[in-house]
């Protein structure tokens, strides 16, 4: 009840009081990506730095093989930013010739994989058309939201084109999650 | 252990139970910027409204001289949005003439200053090329992530060009942090 | 005091310890919008999915008639992303003819309604000029920040043009809030 004091005698097993500093948390930062085969019709996943610089994982939140592993069930805030950079796209040349065109685009997806499900679940997507004329371009896509996750769930960040990801600085491209 | 009840006898000194309403928190909103000298090769810092309107600081999180002061060590979620607005950039004229060009850009950086470190640490950066043709333009850059901060750390928001920041409304440009 | 153990005897009534899993939380996802009359000079509000797929409301946070209802006073993190999509705007044609023009724009506002206030309060605004040349375009606007809300407050998401909102996928356009 509102205003009720949650002394131990009031605790429910399913929602114990717990020290905030003990909650699973991770902030991962970008590293240079190694070329890998990715499944057709599936965006490639980024891999991440998990302990150097600003990056960390704590309280049983582990990072392995491009995935953040969810160590306990609960509501998590999950976020990522990917900074993209590129040269003039073909799209702009076609557009200059006056022919409308489905533009080039950049996309970030935060994906959940559950071993018992055959298909990954897309939790968050940021997608943007890019039709730049006559120049280099760069821009970030930011995503963040709360999800109910289960112990054993795995999170990854997929992008439409790994070669466009700016991997030069840990503050430009990152991925994180924390138990609320 | 999962499901363990965190009654007082189980508490660790380094991670005590604590009332959520007692945690350091701040949400700062934009105000008109006063012209100030800033260091060469360093983006100027914004200053903020700390208590009028939607703005607040609480539980020992203080704002002073463009900095948010971190009153206790822990993991914080830090966020900012800066809305930029401008006129057509020169870049667009060069582009119209068909010459590729490094575009004009807008950048936001959330920076951590630690007195014992000589160099500030860039926690988050949002940077975007801007090549607009024949019009006024406006757009936001949003940033947010979790960081392990130490008591005494100071946070600020730096921008590439203060004159492009939209300071007209508290909901367009803001900066905040809260202990998780 | 810093480092103090918040055992029940130290609890204050106004800030009781409480189980995190018991806090009001919601994540709402996009659905196809039904055309509705909206007030002149006020952006239309989106309505949302509250229980299917990734969407949920819990712990007395309820969704009704386009509003999230705040069930208890406190500091909330509130967020939304809206993905917009459109065809070439007139603005681009005018621009191609060489006449500067106030550009078309897309705007998202997270608004608080308090029954005792005559006017809604705009908590967050993301606004972006859109001047695309010769193509379909799409892009997200993301917002998120912390606010002190009162029991009975209502939150909604308003957009500049409902017909431009991408309602096709729950991961592209969403709205959420959780008590910190």
């Amino acid at each position: 009840l509102k205003g009720q004091e949650f002394a131990p005698s009031h605790q429910q097993v399913y929602a114990p009081l717990r020290a905030d500093g003990d909650k699973p948390r991770a902030h991962l930062t970008v590293v240079r990506q190694t070329p890998t085969q990715h499944l057709k019709n599936q965006f490639p996943a980024l891999h991440w730095e998990h302990e150097l610089g600003l990056a960390f994982t704590k309280n049983r939140m582990n990072y392995t093989n491009k995935f953040l592993l969810i160590p306990e069930s609960g509501d998590y805030f999950v976020y990522s930013q990917v900074t993209f950079r590129g040269m003039t796209s073909e799209c702009s040349e076609i557009r200059q010739a006056g022919r409308p065109n489905k533009p080039d685009s950049i996309t970030v997806v935060i994906t959940k994989v559950t071993d018992s499900y055959p298909e990954p679940t897309q939790l968050l997507m940021g997608t943007k058309s890019v039709c730049e004329v006559g120049s280099n371009w760069f821009q970030p896509i930011y995503l963040g939201a709360m999800f109910s996750l289960q112990e054993g769930d795995k999170l990854m960040v997929n992008v439409s084109d790994i070669s466009l990801v700016d991997y030069t600085k840990e503050d430009k491209t990152f991925f994180g999650a924390f138990l609320l | 252990l999962k499901g363990q009840e965190f009654a007082p006898s189980h508490q660790q000194v380094y991670a005590p139970l604590r009332a959520d309403g007692d945690k350091p928190r701040a949400h700062l909103t934009v105000v008109r910027q006063t012209p100030t000298q800033h260091l060469k090769n360093q983006f100027p810092a914004l200053h903020w409204e700390h208590e009028l309107g939607l703005a607040f600081t609480k539980n020992r999180m203080n704002y002073t001289n463009k900095f948010l002061l971190i009153p206790e060590s822990g993991d914080y979620f830090v966020y900012s949005q800066v809305t930029f607005r401008g006129m057509t950039s020169e870049c667009s004229e060069i582009r119209q003439a068909g010459r590729p060009n490094k575009p004009d850009s807008i950048t936001v950086v959330i920076t951590k200053v630690t007195d014992s470190y000589p160099e500030p640490t860039q926690l988050l950066m949002g940077t975007k090329s801007v090549c607009e043709v024949g019009s006024n333009w406006f757009q936001p850059i949003y940033l947010g992530a979790m960081f392990s901060l130490q008591e005494g750390d100071k946070l600020m928001v730096n921008v590439s060009d203060i004159s492009l920041v939209d300071y007209t409304k508290e909901d367009k440009t803001f900066f905040g942090a809260f202990l998780l | 005091l810093k480092g103090q153990e918040f055992a029940p005897s130290h609890q204050q009534v106004y800030a009781p310890l409480r189980a995190d899993g018991d806090k009001p939380r919601a994540h709402l996802t996009v659905v196809r919008q039904t055309p509705t009359q909206h007030l002149k000079n006020q952006f239309p509000a989106l309505h949302w999915e509250h229980e299917l797929g990734l969407a949920f409301t819990k712990n007395r946070m309820n969704y009704t008639n386009k509003f999230l209802l705040i069930p208890e006073s406190g500091d909330y993190f509130v967020y939304s992303q809206v993905t917009f999509r459109g065809m070439t705007s007139e603005c681009s044609e005018i621009r191609q003819a060489g006449r500067p023009n106030k550009p078309d724009s897309i705007t998202v506002v997270i608004t608080k309604v308090t029954d005792s206030y005559p006017e809604p309060t705009q908590l967050l605004m993301g606004t972006k000029s859109v001047c695309e040349v010769g193509s379909n375009w799409f892009q997200p606007i993301y917002l998120g920040a912390m606010f002190s809300l009162q029991e009975g407050d209502k939150l909604m998401v308003n957009v500049s043009d409902i017909s431009l909102v991408d309602y096709t996928k729950e991961d592209k356009t969403f709205f959420g809030a959780f008590l910190l």
Epitope: - | R32, T34, E49, E51, G53, L54, T168 | Y117
Partner: antibody, heavy 118, light 107 residues
């Protein structure tokens, strides 16, 4: 140039409600904080409260139970109501603008004297 | 509430004099301190904001200094129009509070 002008009755009876309006000209009422401040004859300045264009208000705790400040953005006006007045509420009432905490009250009305007397 | 205490409460000086008025806050207000001049029958006028920033249009003989709890307004060379009452005001928190005023009179 921004100008503020207070208007309202100069005489109010005890126990009644004092009502004043401030009209802002030469600029928009949006994006600023609009305060009422009063000064009893021969005494110092007392802040009553502010309103933001969105309707967000904050009042001096010493007066909070009796004060209501409202705003009409379409008319570029904001108003003060002070209920249950006594002779101690006799003062010159000023409206003033604050851009933000950093900047102080940069524009003031000329003030209007309100006397509480039967 | 934050209490603001000005000293002196009154001051006599002559044209051309250098005058200093002090203001003390009951707790730290960083640099959120403003100074106003009020002539008889007129509204206050902002002179200095943020402890030391000169408001546009105010003569440069007015200056402010200080931070935390102790602040000073200095008039470097008094002019005839400067004889008035001066108030300090904190804008660090609400309620906004003013000092009791310093009346500057001609000697």
């Amino acid at each position: 140039q921004v100008q503020l002008q207070e208007s309202g009755p100069g005489l109010v009876k005890p126990s009644e409600t004092l009502s004043l309006t401030c009209t802002v000209s030469g600029g928009s009422i949006s994006s600023y904080f609009w305060s009422w401040i009063r000064q009893p004859p021969g005494k110092g300045l007392e802040w009553i409260g502010y309103i933001y264009y969105s309707g967000n208000t904050k009042y001096n705790p010493s007066l909070k139970s009796r004060v209501t400040i409202s705003i009409d953005t379409s008319k570029n006006q904001f108003s003060l109501k002070l209920s249950s007045v006594t002779a101690a509420d006799t003062a010159v009432y000023y409206c003033a603008r604050e851009t933000g905490s950093y900047y102080g009250f940069d524009y003031w009305g000329q003030g209007t004297l309100v006397t509480v007397s039967s | 509430d934050i209490q603001m205490t000005q000293s002196p409460s009154s001051l006599s000086a002559s044209v051309g004099d250098r005058v200093t008025i002090t203001c003390r806050a009951s707790q730290s207000i960083n640099n959120y301190l403003n100074w106003y001049q009020q002539r008889p029958g007129k509204a206050p006028k902002l002179l200095i904001y943020a402890a030391s920033s000169l408001q546009s249009g105010v003569p440069s003989r007015f200056s402010g200094s200080g931070s935390g709890t102790d602040f000073t307004l200095t008039i470097s060379s008094l002019q005839p129009g400067d004889f008035a009452t001066y108030y300090c005001q904190q804008s660090y928190s609400t309620p906004r509070t003013f000092g009791q005023g310093t009346k500057l009179e001609i000697k």
